[in-house]
């Protein structure tokens, strides 16, 4: 619609609400992955880079987390996937490069990979919700 | 063309609950926000939260120990209750859209007087 | 929370003439050059009515003698000219930070 803001010019107060979409999608897409994969070990090789630095308070970075989901989504619960991409598009800035993004062939690095980036990608919105709640923004 | 209506009890005893409804027509609320908002007597508006179109809901902080907004999509209607209510609680009560981020709230519903008197 | 706080809290003007209503957030509503304030109309029973939203954008069927401007944390709603029907009460309200605000209202009168 003509009357939304261009997405990389939303206030806090609608990323909060896009992180409060965000929260039980990536929760439960953990949890989820966790049941399916017991027993897999968090990957010390794999580090999303889910907050920007040059912002007060820190920001979702949504060109950096993207790539890894479309990466993972042919590997995981694509609908979930598919609502995560959806609302993490709208809190993209624009023109912003995305990077691609490669799955480990071996299967059990892939499956330590997708546990990693679910697991820092849900602290990571702990992180940003929690800063967007504490007093002016 | 988008249509609020609440309905709901128009005296509520102090210490009990309250619970509105605002029922949509000309659009679904599994889209967009859905907003409560009261007006107190010598017009003050608060705003009170939300319900979104997944069903996520967020509260003003003032309120978050009485408030419960709530939905039933096969109706197309949400739901305000407050619980625990004083006569600081008598206003005008508002149902709103909130149909994008980045925008405001469009359509309002005609509102609904409750006074809080035992 | 960002207080709004809205002068006059009445205003009396005659038919024809311009009406000037302020509107100033005790923090900036602005974020990457939008502004987050927007202005409703409420006539006696009835509900509020959207007339600017994000600082200067006319809503779709208000009139065009109604007009936004400002940013950061100083805005303004004019009319002109002022017409019988714009007896209401006007409020500002921002939503850039939650919880959501709105200033105390503006109830215009035809002298």
């Known amino acids: 619609s003509s009357h939304m803001a261009p997405t990389h010019q939303l206030p806090p107060s609608d990323v909060r609400k896009i992180i409060l979409e965000l929260q039980p999608l990536s929760r439960g897409l953990l949890e989820d992955y966790q049941k399916k994969e017991t027993g897999v070990p968090e990957s010390n090789r794999t580090l999303l880079l889910c907050l920007t630095s040059d912002s007060q308070p820190p920001r979702l970075n949504s060109s950096a987390i993207l790539p890894y989901f479309r990466a993972i989504r042919p590997l995981s619960d694509k609908n979930i996937i598919d609502k995560i991409i959806e609302q993490l598009d709208k809190l993209k800035f624009q023109h912003e490069p995305e990077t691609e993004i490669s799955v480990p062939a071996d299967t059990f690095e892939c499956k330590s990979f997708i546990l990693t980036i679910l697991q820092q990608f849900s602290a990571c919105l702990e992180s940003v919700f929690k800063s967007l709640n504490s007093g002016p923004q | 063309e988008v249509q609020l209506v609440e309905s709901g009890p128009s005296l509520v005893k102090p210490g009990g609950s309250l619970r509105l409804t605002c029922s949509v027509t000309g659009d679904s609320i599994t889209s967009g926000y859905w907003k409560w908002i009261r007006k107190f007597p010598g017009n003050k508006l608060e705003y009170m939260g939300y319900i979104s179109y997944s069903g996520i809901t967020d509260y003003n902080p003032s309120l978050k120990s009485r408030i419960t907004i709530s939905r039933d999509t096969s109706k197309n209607q949400y739901y305000l209750q407050l619980n625990s209510v004083t006569t600081e609680d008598t206003a005008t009560y508002y149902c709103?859209?909130?149909?994008?981020?980045?925008?405001?709230?469009?359509?309002w519903g005609q509102g609904t007087s409750v006074t809080v008197s035992s | 929370d960002i207080v709004m706080t809205q002068s006059p809290a009445s205003l009396s003007v005659s038919l024809g003439q311009r009406a000037t209503i302020s509107c100033r957030a005790s923090?900036?509503?602005?974020?990457?050059?939008?502004?987050?304030m927007h202005w409703y109309q409420q006539k006696p029973g009835q509900s509020p009515k959207l007339l600017i939203y994000r600082a200067s954008n006319l809503e779709s069927g208000i009139p065009a003698r109604f007009g936004g401007s400002g940013s950061g944390t100083d805005f303004t709603l004019t009319i002109d000219p002022v017409q019988a029907d714009d007896v209401a009460t006007y409020y500002c309200?921002?939503?850039?930070?939650?919880?959501?605000?709105f200033g105390g209202g503006t109830k215009l009168e035809i002298k």
């Open positions: 309200h921002q939503s850039y930070e939650d919880p959501w605000t």
């Open positions: 923090e900036s509503v602005d974020t990457y050059g939008r502004s987050f």
């Open positions: 709103a859209r909130y149909p994008n981020y980045g925008y405001a709230m469009d359509y």
